[in-house]
Interface confidence: medium
C-alpha cells in the first residue's frame, strides 16, 4: 500500500530513509539534456523474497540530442501525487541498513541521472530527520516519521525535532540571520518536495544517532 | 499518557519574583524540548521561553530577557521558569508545554497575577 | 516578529453552517502553520498542523489550506462542541507566533 501523502516537513531539517521497504518505487530520473531510453523502465521497484531483496528494473538515461524528436519525460499525473524527493546520496551506506529483511539498499547511481529522487514510499517505512547544516538540535534521540495505516487511510507520525541556528544563543530556536540566499521551502501543498542537502555521508549516521541529532514522536 | 502538571502561580507585587515549575510523567523527560506558554486573561497567547533536552540551549521572547530564567532537573522531570522583576503585562495563565512538534501536549496551566 | 492576523475576530454561526476562518502571516511561512482550539478554562488543542494535516483524534469536519502568506481553517458542518475560540500559529521561524484568536458563538 502506498503511503498517501509525503513525510511532514521540519523547518531547517531534512529527512532520509536508510533503507526502502519491499514496495517502494523510485522513479527513473534523467538530469537535464537526457531522457529516458525507448521502452525503458518507468521506475525502478524494491522486491525480494524473506532472504534477499532488491531492486527491479533499472533506470537508463540516453541523450535527447541522439532523437530531437523525443520529448523530456515527465511522471504521469497519477504518479505525481505521491512524489518524494530526496537529493543524491553519497553511494556509502549506512552499517546496518543490507541486514533489514524485507528491505532494499539505496540503489546505485545510474549515468546520467536527476540531481533528486522521487521516491514513493509505502506503509511501514520510516524516515529520518536531520537539521541542517549550521542549525543544531533541542531534543534528544532518533527523529523518525513512518507511514502508518490507520481506518484505512495512510499517515506519517510527526517527528519530535526542532532545529535552531547554532550561532543564536540570544534569540528563539529557528529565526534565521538575512541571508543572500532564500530559505528555500516549497510552497505546494499537494507535492511537499524535501530535499536531503548534505546528510553527513552515511557512515556517520550510525554514530550520530547515539548523540543528540534526532529524536523521535513519543506520543 | 503524557502529564504536565504547572504550580507556583500566585498573586505578587510588580518587581518581586516568582518560580513556577512543572512536573512531567509520562514520556522520556530528558529527551525533550520543554516550553513556557503564557495567555494573559481575555487574551491571546504567546511563547515565554524554550528549552533543549539538556538545558544548553535556552531561548527568550525579548520581553522577558534578562528576567526570566528557563530551566530543567531532568533528574526529577521538572521544568522551572524563574520570574523576576515581575510587572503588570505580565500577569497570565502560564502553560508548560512539550511535544512541540508532534500534537503539544499542555499543562492545565497557572496563574501568575502581578499587582500593587 | 512574523506578524499573523486573523480575521474575523469572532463570528456567529448555528449548529450545521459551514465556517471559515483566515490567517495572514506578515511574511512566508513556507506551510509551517498550525491550528488551534481553545474553550474557556482550558489549554489550547492542536486540530491541524503543517497546514492540512489534521492531528490524530480530530473529527473530519475540521480541514486546513494555504500557502506562502494566507492560510484558511474550515469547518465544514458546525457542531455543538466546536464553539470555542481559534487560534492560528506559525513556527516556520522563532519565536512562534500565534494570530490573536477568532471567537465563535452561537447565532
Known amino acids: 500500500e502506498l503511503c498517501d501523502d509525503d513525510p511532514p516537513e521540519i523547518p531547517h531539517a531534512t529527512f532520509k530513509a536508510m533503507a526502502y521497504k519491499e514496495g517502494t518505487m523510485l522513479n527513473c530520473e534523467c538530469k537535464r539534456g537526457f531522457r529516458r531510453i525507448k521502452s525503458g523502465s518507468l521506475y525502478m521497484l524494491c522486491t525480494g523474497n524473506s532472504s534477499h531483496s532488491s531492486w527491479d528494473n533499472q533506470c537508463q538515461c540516453t541523450s535527447s540530442a541522439t532523437r530531437n524528436t523525443t520529448k523530456q519525460v515527465t511522471p504521469q499525473p497519477e504518479e505525481q501525487k505521491e512524489r518524494k524527493t530526496t537529493e543524491m546520496q553519497s553511494p556509502m551506506q549506512p552499517v546496518d541498513q543490507a541486514s533489514l529483511p524485507g528491505h532494499c539498499r539505496e540503489p546505485p547511481p545510474w549515468e546520467n541521472e536527476a540531481t533528486e529522487r522521487i521516491y514513493h514510499f509505502v506503509v511501514g517505512q520510516m524516515v529520518y530527520y536531520q537539521c541542517v547544516q549550521g542549525y543544531r538540535a533541542l531534543h534528544r534521540g532518533p527523529a523518525e516519521s513512518v507511514c502508518k495505516m490507520t481506518h484505512g487511510k495512510t499517515r506519517w507520525t510527526q517527528p519530535q525535532l526542532i532545529c535552531t541556528g547554532e550561532m543564536e544563543t540570544s534569540q528563539f530556536p529557528g529565526e534565521e540571520k538575512p541571508q543572500a540566499s532564500p530559505e528555500g521551502r516549497p510552497e505546494s501543498e499537494t507535492s511537499c518536495l524535501v530535499t536531503t542537502t548534505d546528510f553527513q555521508i552515511q557512515t556517520e549516521m550510525a554514530a550520530t544517532m547515539e548523540t543528540s541529532i534526532f529524536t523521535t514522536e513519543y506520543q | 499518557q503524557v502529564q504536565l502538571v504547572e504550580s507556583g502561580g500566585g498573586v505578587v507585587q510588580p518587581g518581586r519574583s516568582l518560580r513556577l515549575s512543572c512536573a512531567a510523567s509520562?514520556?522520556?523527560?530528558?529527551?525533550?524540548?520543554m516550553a513556557w506558554v503564557r495567555q494573559a486573561p481575555g487574551k491571546g497567547l504567546e511563547w515565554v521561553a524554550v528549552?533543549?533536552?539538556?538545558?544548553?540551549?535556552?531561548y527568550y521572547r525579548d520581553s522577558v530577557k534578562g528576567r526570566f530564567t528557563i530551566s530543567r532537573d531532568n533528574a526529577q522531570n521538572t521544568l522551572y521558569l524563574q520570574m523576576n522583576s515581575l510587572r503588570a503585562e505580565d500577569t497570565a495563565v502560564y502553560y508548560c508545554?512539550?511535544?512541540?512538534?508532534?500534537?503539544?501536549?499542555w499543562g492545565q496551566g497557572t496563574l501568575v497575577t502581578v499587582s500593587s | 516578529d512574523i506578524q499573523m492576523t486573523q480575521s474575523p475576530s469572532s463570528l456567529s454561526a448555528s449548529v450545521g453552517d459551514r465556517v471559515t476562518i483566515t490567517c495572514r502571516a506578515s511574511?512566508?511561512?513556507?506551510?509551517?502553520l498550525n491550528w488551534y482550539q481553545q474553550k474557556p478554562g482550558e489549554a489550547p488543542r492542536r486540530l491541524i498542523y503543517?497546514?492540512?494535516s489534521l492531528q490524530s483524534g480530530v473529527p473530519s469536519r475540521f480541514s486546513g489550506s494555504g500557502s506562502g502568506t494566507d492560510y484558511t481553517l474550515t469547518i465544514s458542518s458546525l457542531q455543538p462542541e466546536d464553539f470555542a475560540t481559534y487560534y492560528c500559529?506559525?513556527?516556520?521561524?522563532?519565536?512562534?507566533?500565534f494570530g490573536q484568536g477568532t471567537k465563535l458563538e452561537i447565532k
Open positions: 508545554t512539550t511535544g512541540l512538534n508532534s500534537g503539544y501536549d
Open positions: 511574511q512566508n511561512v513556507s506551510s509551517f
Open positions: 500559529q506559525q513556527y516556520n521561524s522563532w519565536p512562534w507566533t
Open positions: 509520562g514520556f522520556t523527560f530528558s529527551n525533550h524540548a
Open positions: 503543517g497546514t492540512n
Open positions: 528549552i533543549s533536552y539538556d538545558g544548553s540551549n535556552k
